[in-house]
Amino acid sequence: QKPPKRKTPAQPKVPACCEEVQELKAQVANLSRVLSELGRKQEKDWVSVVMQVMELESSGKRMESRLTEAESKYSEMNNQIDIMQLQAAQTLTQTSADAIYDCSSLYQKNYRISGVYRLPSNDFLGSPELEVFCDMETKGGGWTVIQRRKSGLVSFYRDWKQYKQGFGSIRGDFWLGNEHIHRLSRQPTRLRVEMEDWEGTVRYAEYSHFVLSNELNSYRLFLGNYSGNAGNDALYYHNNTAFSTKDKDNDNCLDKCAQLRKGGYWYNCCTDSNLNGVYYRLGEHDKHLDGITWYGWHGANYSLKRVEMKIRPEDFKP
């Protein structure tokens, strides 16, 4: 899975007469050129990272240290792109006093490149600075990605604190953090779940309303109507259910679902879906109940190849 190709940001419509605006335009054009070059460099480097990761899988003992090396190389490389992106975004938004609180805000300010952004802290909303991945392309864009599974390099069998704060690599596999997701869903929000199986088929599920309650309410999940092509709604069973982790059992079960399903999730008793389950590779992907499952599509024993969960405001207009 390559990282998304980066597009030139759309230019805002401004009077041509204004020198200041012309200067800004020139800055953006320049930054866009730099971005394109870095994007090309990134794709080449990504191939070498993938090769390293594949190598890692067959070298048991050296896996951890080599993985760290590969990840830090990739991170370093992407940091350059992040700086360029953020400068581009700031160039476009400096003149506006509107708060940037999610990816849809950035989209509305004409930032149209999918990738990593650092959302500024907001004292009024009580939200800290947050690094997010924005999907500016899917179905009009403006999506803040809250979860991704694609490489299997990050364990999702984590404790309450880690699920609260978030973990993983923002460009790879990650959980944004329940506290952040809760804050982002305080306004009316949509949820989109995208899935890919091991045959390369892609499906999605979308929910007209998505709320994650606060920690006091155990990050309970509330969902609106389902639409999509991922078969039967496999999140309905988890609706109005508290979040559980291996060290905090909030499920409706005599068994500890988080321990049985090896993840943190809105476990009922136990699953119709388990998007934070164990990442199983091809060959092992259809043998386990604790995988990344979506019952409505491939059943209870099929672990998916890729999953992404993303949110945006209900009233978002591309």
Partner: antibody, heavy 125, light 107 residues
């Protein structure tokens, strides 16, 4: 043969305490969740409490929460119900039951497949 | 808490009759329903679990159906030993709850 035998019932004054025991045999006790159900004279069944096989998860009916404690000793194949601050309305026959688990499509279904004969608890002054 | 409501509360029937007892949950419980039979002075006995699965050793004249909120226990041909009280019970979420019972007696 799977068997459950309750004991420890009797007459107790309001505010008093009692500990019920349930001795299990004929199955691997530690592998199964267990439950207590009661039946007041002339009334229907009321679920009281349940405990997982390891003893790590416990659940209670609102009517007994904070007063009753379910526990188990897997080395002795015994289930317990410690009843404190007893009230007249706790008067009932108390049954212990083995909880069986079935799994369909990733969901666990629980049901009480074997029951003891019951022990009578009377709370009266 | 999920409320379970059985109907009728009692039914008079003859040997050979088909008897149907219904149980309604106050909210959806998928198929998390069990049916028990209890005779006077005896412990309850499991008949049906997961709404429609027949417990081992239970005669095939007993059957269960339903999903969500509405469930049915059917005795296709009533036998003398079937005169008893029947309870439905949900295990969808804690606290587990029983219906108030349906007494089947001789007409």
């Amino acid at each position: 043969e799977v068997q459950l035998v309750e004991s420890g019932g009797g007459l107790v004054q309001p505010g008093g305490s009692l500990r019920l025991s349930c001795a299990a045999s004929g199955f691997t006790f530690s592998s199964y969740a267990m439950s207590w159900v009661r039946q007041a004279p002339g009334k229907g069944l009321e679920w009281v409490s349940a405990i997982s096989g390891s003893g790590g998860s416990t659940y209670y009916a609102d009517s007994v929460k904070g007063r009753f404690t379910i526990s188990r000793d897997n080395s002795k194949n015994t289930l317990y119900l410690q009843m404190n601050s007893l009230r007249a309305e706790d008067t009932a026959v108390y049954y212990c039951a083995k909880v069986e688990r079935d799994m369909v499509r990733g969901h666990y279904y629980y049901y009480m497949d074997v029951w003891g004969k019951g022990t009578t608890v009377t709370v009266s002054s | 808490d999920i409320q379970m409501t059985q109907s009728p509360s009692s039914v008079s029937a003859s040997v050979g009759d088909r008897v149907t007892i219904t149980c309604r949950a106050s909210q959806g419980i998928s198929s998390w329903l069990a049916w028990y039979q209890q005779k006077p002075g005896k412990a309850p006995k499991l008949l049906i679990y997961a709404a429609s699965s027949l417990q081992s050793g239970v005669p095939s004249r007993f059957s269960g159906s339903g999903s969500g909120t509405d469930f049915t226990l059917t005795i296709s041909s009533l036998q003398p030993e079937d005169f008893a009280t029947y309870y439905c019970q949900q295990a969808n979420s804690f606290p587990w709850t029983f219906g108030q019972g349906t007494k089947v007696d001789i007409k």
